[in-house]
Amino acid sequence: TVPPMVNVTRSEASEGNITVTCRASSFYPRNIILTWRQDGVSLSHDTQQWGDVLPDGNGTYQTWVATRICAGEEQRFTCYMEHSGNHSTHPVPS
């Protein structure tokens, strides 16, 4: 088992909004849960966009999940990752 490296980034979207993207890379096996939580609960699926789980050329895999949020409310959002029985949560950078 190779645990993922998880990285959260932000980019400006429309005025007053930002897109936050959570990327997991270099993990094996390919089964992974990657999702955004808002206020500690699941963010609905229709407000998230997922990338495919793709091989990254090193025998491991990569994927991403993104959502659009209001600027100034970053603290309310965390990226949740689960892989091979391990869990971690990742905040949006300031």
């Epitope: 206020d39 609960v41 603290q75």
Partner: antibody
Framework: DVQLQESGPGLVKPSQSLSLTCTVT?????????WNWIRQFPRNKLEWMGY???????NYNPSLKSRISITRDTSKNQFFLQLISVTTEDTATYYC????????????WGQGTLVTVSA | DIQMTQSPASLSASVGETVTITCRAS??????LAWYQQKQGKSPQLLVY???MLADGVPSRFSASGSGTQYSLKINSLQPEDFGSYYC?????????FGAGTKVEIK
Amino acid sequence: DVQLQESGPGLVKPSQSLSLTCTVTGYSITSDYAWNWIRQFPRNKLEWMGYINYSGTTNYNPSLKSRISITRDTSKNQFFLQLISVTTEDTATYYCSYYRYDGAWFPYWGQGTLVTVSA
Amino acid sequence: DIQMTQSPASLSASVGETVTITCRASGNIHNYLAWYQQKQGKSPQLLVYNAIMLADGVPSRFSASGSGTQYSLKINSLQPEDFGSYYCQHFWSFPLTFGAGTKVEIK
């Protein structure tokens, strides 16, 4: 460590309002987290009532939405529960707690305060 | 709302025994589950979060498992301090709801 302490009257008359205070020490309620009220009925059933978060946003249990209000006093690092038009069914031990945004579980609770609704 | 059904409602066990408590959700909660222990006259204390993760300071005789709608809490070699009530709580969506509890008593 975050510490929470509930206070308020132990006896409220039916149709009146129940008002409780949670005093938080060891952490600023404006820094982060969701600050919650949870109650436990005499037969031990637990009910999440709602929260006010670090920015003042509230979220209530729909079963209580028409009767509940959670507010705060940031200068005193306190948050408050008001429940209007109480009945004997609101007799319970009321707890304040908080959760972090990595997941809505409750790592620490206040000691609880028993509120009896009776004429 | 997601309803949480716990079983059994109560059980009697001896020190040293292994006990298992189960919690069933009315919908898939995707491991968004916590377990609490409550002793008489005290506040609930967090035992488990994210379905399987032991909270800080929780002894390793406690373990938790499950997925989808079915979850369980297992206590190996029950100790005197383990007697009390246990509650599950989901945090998949609002409103957050709790199970009705399981009371673990001394046989």
